[in-house]
C-alpha cells in the first residue's frame, strides 16, 4: 500500500480468482483513543472499533472511503483505491490502446518545434468518475524539470456503438535549448483513477522523435504565362523553430485530382516554392518535415487549382 | 562560443555537400545495423545514449546560432558563455568563433573515425561475419575532414589484446551509430546555417 495523495491510498493486488488479497491496517488520524468506530462509504454498518482497523482487501467491494467516527463526529477519512496486477502486468482497463505507432501505445505525444513544449493525448470510453494527473521529467534517475498543465477533455467522437473521449495535456521543459542534442529522454507519467480503480501509464521519448511541424503557411499559386504550369509558394509555419537556416524543413508538394483514384504527382524540395502542372479540378497540397531528422510529416496545407 | 553571422568562405559550400552525404551515410548504416542486429538491443528506446565526445569537444555550444545565444538554457551548460562583439561580425574572414566551431566538428569526426575503425577491426574477426561498417560512411567522414582542412595530430587506432566480445561490440556499434547520427544532424544544421549566413 502507498499514498497517492493526502488520505488517498493505493492497494496493489495480484488479481486472480480466489486471491488472498492484501491485509491493510488503517489508523484514525486523531489524538482520541476510545469510542472510535469505522464505516465504509455511505453505509452506517460499523466495521470495527478502535484507533486502527485491519481489513483484508481482495476485491473492489473492499475498496472505498473508510471513515472513523466518535460520537457521531467524523474524525478522518482514508480512501482506498485498487491497482490490479494481472499475471505480472499492471492492468490497462481505463485507457484505449491507440496501436500507433505500435501496439500498447496508450499515450501519444507530439511537439511542433524544438522549444521543449509538447502535447500528449490519450483515449478512453469512460465518461464519468474519471480523473487524471500528469507528471513529467527529463530523465528518471536525476530528473530535470518539466511542467505540465491539467489534463482536459479535448475531443469526443462516436466510434460504432461507443463514445470515445480524448484527453490532452500540454507540458514544457523548464530549461530547454532548441539546439541541444538530447541524451536523456522525456518521461511522462499519467495517473488515472476511475471510481476505485487506479492505473498508471508512462511514455518515454526524445523531443526529436515526436516532432511534427505545423503545415506550411501562406500557400499561394502564381500561374506561369502561356503554360499549364503554376508556381506554388509557401512559408515556414510560425510555430517552427528559428533560425530557419539552422532548423531547416524539407517539403513535399502533391497535385491530387478530384478523385482519390487519380494518380498523385509528388515533388520533394528544400525550397519554399516549386513549379507544378495544375490539372483541372485538382488541388495542390504541401507538407513539411525536419530536413535532417526524419520524424513525422506535418498535415497538408492545400489550395484548389482553379 | 556562439556562431556569428559571418560572410562565409567560398570553401563553405562543399562542406554543406559533404555534411549532407555524411548524414545520409550514417542514417543508412544505422538502418542496416537495426535490421541486421534485430535480435540485439539496437533501437533508440533500448540503447544507452552515450556521447563519446562529451567533455572532449563542444560542438553544440561552439556552433550555436547567434539567434540562440539569447536563450539562457543554451548557454548554461557551458563553462563560459562567450558572446562575440560587433567587430568580430564585421570580419570578412571566417571569424575566430567559426574556426572554433569547425575545429570542434573536425575533432568529433576524428574521434568517431578512430572508434569506427577500431570497431570494424573487431567485427572482421567475428566468425559470424554478421555486420561490418559501411566503407562509404568511413570515406564520407574522411572527405568532410579533408574539406574542413584542419591539421591535428593523428590519433593512433586503439588496439586491444583481449579476445573481443562480439555481442558487446555490436551493442556498442549501435550506441555509436545512434550518437553519430545525432551529431551528423547537428553538423548538417550548422553547415546549412553557415551556408545561408
Amino acid at each position: 500500500i502507498w499514498e497517492l495523495k493526502k488520505d488517498v491510498y493505493v492497494v496493489e493486488l495480484d488479481w486472480y480468482p480466489d486471491a488472498p488479497g492484501e491485509m491493510v491496517v488503517l489508523t484514525c488520524d486523531t489524538p482520541e483513543e476510545d469510542g472510535i468506530t469505522w464505516t465504509l462509504d455511505q453505509s452506517s454498518e460499523v466495521l470495527g472499533s478502535g484507533k486502527t482497523l485491519t481489513i483484508q482487501v481482495k476485491e473492489f467491494g473492499d475498496a472505498g472511503q473508510y471513515t472513523c467516527h466518535k460520537g457521531g463526529e467524523v474524525l478522518s477519512h482514508s480512501l482506498l483505491l485498487l491497482h490490479k496486477k494481472e499475471d505480472g502486468i499492471w492492468s490497462t482497463d481505463i485507457l484505449k490502446d491507440q496501436k500507433e505507432p505500435k501496439n500498447k501505445t496508450f499515450l501519444r505525444c507530439e511537439a511542433k518545434n524544438y522549444s521543449g513544449r509538447f502535447t500528449c493525448w490519450w483515449l478512453t470510453t469512460i465518461s464519468t468518475d474519471l480523473t487524471f494527473s500528469v507528471k513529467s521529467s527529463r530523465g528518471s534517475s536525476d530528473p530535470q524539470g518539466v511542467t505540465c498543465g491539467a489534463a482536459t477533455l479535448s475531443a469526443e467522437r462516436v466510434r460504432g456503438d461507443n463514445k470515445e473521449y480524448e484527453y490532452s495535456v500540454e507540458c514544457q521543459e523548464d530549461s530547454a535549448c532548441p539546439a541541444a542534442e538530447e541524451s536523456l529522454p522525456i518521461e511522462v507519467m499519467v495517473d488515472a483513477v476511475h471510481k476505485l480503480k487506479y492505473e498508471n501509464y508512462t511514455s518515454s521519448f526524445f523531443i526529436r522523435d515526436i516532432i511534427k511541424p505545423d503545415p506550411p503557411k501562406n500557400l499561394q499559386l502564381k500561374p506561369l504565362k502561356n503554360s499549364r504550369q503554376v508556381e506554388v509558394s509557401w512559408e515556414y509555419p510560425d510555430t517552427w523553430s528559428t533560425p530557419h537556416s539552422y532548423f531547416s524543413l524539407t517539403f513535399c508538394v502533391q497535385v491530387q485530382g478530384k478523385s482519390k483514384r487519380e494518380k498523385k504527382d509528388r515533388v520533394f524540395t528544400d525550397k519554399t516554392s516549386a513549379t507544378v502542372i495544375c490539372r483541372k479540378n485538382a488541388s495542390i497540397s504541401v507538407r513539411a518535415q525536419d530536413r535532417y531528422y526524419s520524424s513525422s510529416w506535418s498535415e497538408w496545407a492545400s489550395v484548389p487549382c482553379s | 562560443r556562439n556562431l556569428p553571422v559571418a560572410t562565409p568562405d567560398p570553401g563553405m559550400f562543399p562542406c554543406l555537400h559533404h555534411s549532407q552525404n555524411l548524414l545520409r551515410a550514417v542514417s543508412n548504416m544505422l538502418q542496416k545495423a537495426r535490421q541486421t542486429l534485430e535480435f540485439y538491443p539496437c533501437t533508440s528506446e533500448e540503447i544507452d545514449h552515450e556521447d563519446i565526445t562529451k567533455d572532449k569537444t563542444s560542438t553544440v555550444e561552439a556552433c550555436l546560432p547567434l539567434e540562440l545565444t539569447k536563450n539562457e538554457s543554451c548557454l548554461n551548460s557551458r563553462e563560459t558563455s562567450f558572446i562575440t562583439n560587433g567587430s568580430c561580425l564585421a570580419s570578412r574572414k571566417t571569424s575566430f568563433m567559426m574556426a572554433l566551431c569547425l575545429s570542434s566538428i573536425y575533432e568529433d569526426l576524428k574521434m568517431y573515425q578512430v572508434e569506427f575503425k577500431t570497431m570494424n577491426a573487431k567485427l572482421l574477426m567475428d566468425p559470424k561475419r554478421q555486420i561490418f561498417l559501411d566503407q562509404n560512411m568511413l570515406a564520407v567522414i574522411d572527405e568532410l575532414m579533408q574539406a574542413l582542412n584542419f591539421n591535428s595530430e593523428t590519433v593512433p587506432q586503439k588496439s586491444s589484446l583481449e579476445e573481443p566480445d562480439f555481442y558487446k561490440t555490436k551493442i556498442k556499434l549501435c550506441i555509436l551509430l545512434h550518437a553519430f547520427r545525432i551529431r551528423a544532424v547537428t553538423i548538417d544544421r550548422v553547415m546549412s546555417y553557415l551556408n545561408a549566413s
Epitope: 488479481w15 480466489d18 499475471d87 | 538491443p41
Partner: antibody, heavy 115, light 112 residues
Framework: QVQLVQSGGGVVQPGRSLRLSCAAS????????MHWVRQAPGKGLEWVAF????????YYADSVKGRFTISRDNSKNTLYLQMKSLRAEDTAVYYC????????WGQGTMVTVSS | SYVLTQPPSVSGTPGQRVTISCSGG????????VKWYQQLPGTAPKLLIY???QRPSGVPDRFSGSKSGTSASLAITGVQAEDEADYYC????????????FGTGTKVTVLG
C-alpha cells in the same frame, strides 16, 4: 472454490458452426479476464482468444480471426466461444481458463471437425 | 507459430535432477514473466511455477523455475515416477499481450 465447467463440444462437419460454453462458479466472474486455449491431438497448447472482464476488448489468434467469436454473459457467469466455418485443423480439446498469475482451467471439451 | 522453444524430450532416472529450457526473445521472455505447466495425459494443464520462480501452494518444492535474459528453465530436483508428463512454458509478447505464448512442450520420461 473456483470451478469452470465446459460444455458444447462434439463432432461437426467442415464449414459448420459450434458454440462452446464455460460456466464459472466460486468467484466473482465479472471481475476477471478469460481465455480459450486449445490442444490438437498429440500436439502442444495453442492460445485461441481472450476477453476482458467487462467484455470491452477481445483478442484472437490469427488462425481463428474472423471465424471465432469470444463473448461472455456476466449475469449468467458464462463464457462462450462461437466457432464458424470450422476446418479439420480446428479439431482439438478446447479449454477455458481464468487470466492471472494463478489460473484455473476447465476440464476441456473435444471438438472434432470431420466429414 | 511457436516462438518459445523447448527441447522435445528429456529423461532421467528417479532421484536425478532434470532441467527443461525455454528459449524466447527480447519482446517475450525478455520483457515478461514466465509460467510453467505440467500436463498429465488426458487432463488439463496444472500450474507449477508463476512469475518466473514462484511456486503455488501444493506444488512440491522439487520443482523450481528461473529466468535469465531471454530464456527460462524449469528444474526438477530428484525426479519421481509421477513427474512423467508434458511440460509447457508460457509467457507473453509485449506487442500482443494478453495473447498467451506457449512453448513447444517437453516430454519428461522417468527411466527405470
Amino acid at each position: 472454490q473456483v470451478q469452470l465447467v465446459q460444455s458444447g463440444g462434439g463432432v461437426v462437419q467442415p464449414g459448420r458452426s459450434l458454440r462452446l460454453s464455460c460456466a464459472a462458479s466460486g468467484f466473482t466472474f465479472s471481475s476477471y479476464g478469460m481465455h480459450w486455449v486449445r490442444q490438437a491431438p498429440g500436439k502442444g497448447l495453442e492460445w485461441v482468444a481472450f476477453i476482458r472482464y467487462d467484455g470491452s476488448n477481445k483478442y484472437y489468434a490469427d488462425s481463428v480471426k474472423g471465424r471465432f467469436t469470444i463473448s461472455r454473459d456476466n449475469s449468467k457467469n458464462t463464457l462462450y466461444l462461437q466457432m464458424k466455418s470450422l476446418r479439420a485443423e480446428d479439431t482439438a480439446v478446447y479449454y477455458c481458463k481464468t487470466h492471472g498469475s494463478h489460473d484455473n482451467w476447465g476440464q476441456g471439451t473435444m471438438v472434432t471437425v470431420s466429414s | 507459430s511457436y516462438v518459445l522453444t523447448q527441447p522435445p524430450s528429456v529423461s532421467g532416472t528417479p532421484g536425478q535432477r532434470v532441467t527443461i529450457s525455454c528459449s524466447g526473445g527480447r519482446s517475450n521472455i525478455g520483457s515478461n514473466t514466465v509460467k510453467w505447466y505440467q500436463q498429465l495425459p488426458g487432463t488439463a494443464p496444472k500450474l507449477l511455477i508463476y512469475i518466473n520462480d514462484q511456486r503455488p501452494s501444493g506444488v512440491p518444492d522439487r520443482f523450481s523455475g528461473s529466468k535469465s535474459g531471454t530464456s527460462a528453465s524449469l528444474a526438477i530436483t530428484g525426479v519421481q515416477a509421477e513427474d512423467e508428463a508434458d511440460y509447457y512454458c508460457q509467457s507473453y509478447d509485449r506487442g500482443t499481450h494478453p495473447a498467451l505464448l506457449f512453448g513447444t512442450g517437453t516430454k519428461v520420461t522417468v527411466l527405470g
